[in-house]
């Protein structure tokens, strides 16, 4: 907290400019008008203020907007955003994707901070759903974003947004998340033809039920082992040896290298040895 002191004669700031970097903290407090700061926030980032000086500027904005900053100020916060606490951010009402992008840019290259997580949460809740443009933006900055959401949060993703999802965005998703996303992907890609459909749906198959895997096995899709290893155990177990052979095509030989790992191990254990022997891979049930 900076003490209230009168501004020295001739030091009253008429605009936010480089001369302010020479002001002591108390001078910034006394000589910079909060309303002026709010209207010229876009200039702050061009000026090499110290962290201590930024604390003073934040304090002035907090006094001016005790109920939370308006979006016109938020959009131009720049590095001052790093000074905000999750509690500060919870007071905001961010509706513009441009504002979101501007603030994410400040944190670019770093892991998702509690501040960023709160900002995203406020933004998505304000929109009511995770639309395609928002998802595009968030996964561009944080490829793991989708998998950081709970199954409940993922349920608000409309099928149309699924087009924005790239395979790497699903790398860290667990089965419960894929259980929610798979039906949405199935709906989003339903009008595509066989081979194109498989390319798109492949990343989501960790949420696919047995009947969909059986259907895919009839379409010569040649699923790779990496995808097969991500399938739900309960979906894989009922598949016959013939169905797995058709599903994997030439990749079926890869089962040998994965025979000690789930879900391959669980599947092998539940097959008749005679059937396994037809694969010629030496798999032991």
């Amino acid at each position: 907290e900076v003490e209230k002191t009168a501004c020295p004669s001739g030091k009253k700031a008429r605009e936010i400019d480089e001369s302010l970097i020479f002001y002591k903290k108390w001078e910034l407090e006394a000589c910079v008008d909060a309303a002026l700061l709010a209207t010229q926030m876009d200039r702050v980032n061009a000026i090499p203020f110290t962290y201590e000086q930024l604390d003073v500027l934040k304090h002035k904005l907090d006094e001016l907007y005790p109920q939370g900053y308006p979006e016109s100020v938020i959009q131009h916060l720049g590095y001052l955003f790093l000074k905000m606490s999750p509690e500060d951010i919870r007071k905001w009402n961010v509706t513009s994707l441009e504002t979101l992008k501007a603030l994410l840019e400040v944190n670019k290259g770093h892991e998702m901070s509690p501040q960023v997580a709160t900002l995203i949460d406020r933004f998505v809740k304000g929109r009511g759903q995770l639309d395609k443009d928002t998802l595009d933006t968030l996964t561009a900055f944080y490829p793991g974003y989708l998998c950081s959401l709970s199954p409940e949060e993922l349920s608000s993703v409309p099928p149309s947004s699924i087009w924005a999802v790239r395979p790497q965005d699903l790398d860290t998703c667990d089965p419960r998340q894929l259980d929610v996303l798979y039906p949405k992907a199935r709906l989003a890609f339903q009008n595509m033809n066989g081979s194109e459909y498989f390319v798109k749906i492949q990343s989501f198959l960790g949420g696919a039920p047995t009947e969909d895997l059986k259907a895919l096995s009839q379409q010569n899709v040649s699923m790779d082992l990496a995808t097969f290893m991500k399938l739900r155990t309960d979906a894989v177990l009922p598949l016959t040896v013939a169905e797995v052979q058709k599903l994997l095509g030439p990749h079926v030989e890869g089962l040998k290298a994965e025979e000690r790992h789930r879900p391959v191990r669980d599947w092998i254990l539940r097959q008749r040895q005679d059937d396994l022997d037809t694969l010629g891979l030496g798999l032991q049930g």
Epitope: T233, H261, R265, L269, R270, G285
Partner: antibody, heavy 119, light 107 residues
Framework: QVQLQESGPGLVKPSETLSLTCTVS??????????WSWIRQPPGKGLEWIGY???????NYNPSLKSRVTISVDTSKNQFSLKLSSVTAADTAVYYC???????????WGQGTMVTVSS | DIQMTQSPSSLSASVGDRVTITCRAS??????VNWYQQKPGKAPKLLIY???SLQSGVPSRFSGSGSGTDFTLTISSLQPEDFATYYC?????????FGGGTKVEIK
């Protein structure tokens, strides 16, 4: 409600064979979704998985114990058993039998039986 | 074998505290990691399976997260009955392995 109960001698002499049986009640050892494991815990130490068996008779053992372990299943008695040969004092532990439900983990455990290896 | 390294090996906490226990696998275990609670003289009890799924009947203050090699068990608000030893376990590889355990004691 599936329950497991271990039984067997509490004292075994060094170099002899430890034999334990686990009786499954309230469910079938022939369950499609379950394998049946033995796990042990030396006094004051952590848990060590010994091995599992499926009702078909297929087994999988801890590599460090494999040469001394045999797990078998008797579907008619709804039981599975553990034999550990050439025991030493290092095999003194509480021995648990547990159900490994394929979609979760060791979700049902016996209460455990203490086995001491001593002459 | 996949080695499971748990940390810390013990911790002291108060009722109401948020407690986090971590488990690191020596190689990827995908999401096939389970968490157990064990009280003295009792058999372990399954809390979390498949890294993040809550076992039926387990209080919602317990949660799990992680995939690959790094996994976390969190107790959001420690209760008196939660003082116990916690173990992680991987079942991805056929040779199942447990972590060394974390003893949660009263501060």
């Amino acid at each position: 409600q599936v329950q497991l109960q271990e039984s067997g001698p509490g004292l075994v002499k060094p170099s002899e064979t430890l034999s334990l049986t686990c009786t499954v009640s309230g469910g079938s050892v022939s369950s499609y979704y379950s394998t049946w494991s033995w796990i042990r815990q030396p006094p004051g130490k952590g848990l060590e998985w010994i091995g599992y068996i499926y009702y078909s008779g297929s087994t999988n053992y801890n590599p460090s114990l494999k040469s001394r372990v045999t797990i078998s299943v008797d579907t008619s008695k709804n039981q599975f058993s553990l034999k550990l040969s050439s025991v030493t004092a290092a095999d003194t532990a509480v021995y648990y039998c547990a159900r490994d439900f394929v979609l979760s983990g060791f979700d049902i455990w016996g209460q455990g039986t203490m086995v001491t290896v001593s002459s | 074998d996949i080695q499971m390294t748990q940390s810390p090996s013990s911790l002291s906490a108060s009722v109401g505290d948020r407690v986090t226990i971590t488990c690191r696998a020596s190689q990827s275990s995908r999401y096939y990691v389970n968490w157990y609670q064990q009280k003295p003289g009792k058999a372990p009890k399954l809390l979390i399976y498949a890294a993040s799924s809550l076992q039926s009947g387990v209080p919602s203050r317990f949660s799990g997260s992680g995939s690959g090699t790094d996994f976390t068990l969190t107790i959001s608000s420690l209760q008196p009955e939660d003082f116990a030893t916690y173990y992680c376990q991987q079942s991805y590889d056929a040779s199942y392995t447990f972590g060394g355990g974390t003893k949660v004691e009263i501060k």
